[in-house]
């Protein structure tokens, strides 16, 4: 069977060669070919070329649309997981671990503490902070979590804040705070999460996370 296929391919190739040669002869105006024959062959060839060019255009259009879809409006999303830190800073630390998401380089986690975006637009930004505290062991002030914005050359802004009173449970009672909202971010803008007492934050799987999604 393979041998027969090979013979068939060679025959088709030979026919193509003859067809091309005939077009060449038509073009040079060889006497042995009738005018009618040449016209027919030429229009056949033009038809082939037109088909090829149309296909090429369609492919080009499809590709440019794909590029537009992919390039102009790529998905930008991030979800990072809390990381226990020895630092006494009130800014929570995050890591790309576990069930994390970092869609592409248009959003980055910088210094383990802030998500920075490269494109301007509306973003849904959220954070969940789970903490374990006890009324007696803690100060009178409530546990406060803040979602903050820092843009290049501009002061920090508090976008969202939530407060919870401390639990009476011993040694401590777990509580969760969820923050989320839609905000306009400029290129280079960073968002981060601040808490009043980072030592009370729970870092167990799924308890504390932070992320954003470009709308």
């Amino acid at each position: 069977h393979r041998r027969l296929d090979k013979i068939e391919d060679e025959r088709n190739l030979h026919e193509d060669f003859v067809f091309m040669k005939t077009i060449q002869r038509c073009n040079t105006g060889e006497r042995s070919l009738s005018l009618l024959n040449c016209e027919e062959i030429k229009s056949q060839f033009e038809g082939f070329v037109k088909d090829i060019m149309l296909n090429k255009e369609e492919t080009k259009k499809e590709n440019s649309f794909e590029m537009q879809k992919g390039d102009q409006n790529p998905q930008i999303a991030a979800h990072v997981i809390s990381e226990a830190s020895s630092k006494t800073t009130s800014v929570l630390q995050w890591a790309e671990k576990g069930y994390y998401t970092m869609s592409n380089n248009l959003v980055t986690l910088e210094n383990g503490k802030q998500l920075t975006v490269k494109r301007q637009g509306l973003y849904y930004i959220y954070a969940q902070v789970t903490f374990c505290s006890n009324r007696e062991a803690s100060s009178q002030a409530p546990f406060i979590a803040s979602l903050c914005l820092k843009s290049p050359g501009r002061f920090e802004r508090i976008l969202l804040r939530a407060a919870n009173t401390h639990s009476s449970a011993k040694p401590c009672g777990q509580q969760s705070i969820h923050l989320g909202g839609v905000f306009e971010l400029q290129p280079g803008a960073s968002v981060f999460v601040n808490v009043t007492d980072p030592s009370q934050v729970s870092h167990g799987t799924g308890f504390t996370s932070f992320g954003l999604l470009k709308l």
Epitope: G153, R154, R157, I158
Partner: antibody, heavy 121, light 107 residues
Framework: EVQLLESGGGLVQPGGSLRLSCAAS????????MSWVRQAPGKGLEWVSG????????YYADSVKGRFTISRDNSKNTLYLQMNSLRAEDTAVYYC??????????????WGQGTLVTVSS | DIQMTQSPSSLSASVGDRVTITCRTS??????ANWYQQKPGKAPKLLIY???RLESGVPSRFSGSGSGTDFTLTISSLQPEDFATYYC?????????FGGGTKVGIK
Amino acid sequence: EVQLLESGGGLVQPGGSLRLSCAASGFTFSDYDMSWVRQAPGKGLEWVSGISGSGATTYYADSVKGRFTISRDNSKNTLYLQMNSLRAEDTAVYYCARDSSGSYYYPLDYWGQGTLVTVSS
Amino acid sequence: DIQMTQSPSSLSASVGDRVTITCRTSQSISSYANWYQQKPGKAPKLLIYGASRLESGVPSRFSGSGSGTDFTLTISSLQPEDFATYYCQQTYSTPWTFGGGTKVGIK
């Protein structure tokens, strides 16, 4: 009612120093970024310096960088501007202004009445 | 630093006139443009922030528009108390900068 009251202005010789104060009331001072803006006689407004609510971040106009220092004492609800190596071109009315914290756009929504600083020999 | 070019530097108008002041920036500042009104011997007063948002308590005859590099302050029907100097300001990037001002005088 929000109030900002500047003090400390006066006549000083070139190369001298002066410290301006701005007493704030009617709002939670530490929640707001603050700025100093000046206006030379018969001229336009010039932003001089700004400080974040916590006092951790400061910004300066190039014309005063290295000579002026902005600071704040949140326990006293007071904003300061320490002016050193003063020049004749620093002569102006100095306004203290509050930066609206609830906006993306950092507008200066409340202003003091200003204090005049004259640098002359 | 971002330069703010305000025009005209002065204009004369009558009560009831529509007045337009423009501000052009040396680079795009998105919508980070604010407008202030200042009367002689007084502190400036915020009118418009974020290019088009009217500050609380400011009459609706004042409006702002624009984004990027071109911004406009419009007073739809000039009132006697509107004769003052108007300044645009950018807060896109420090150092914040002001336009040179536009003095609106009586014709």
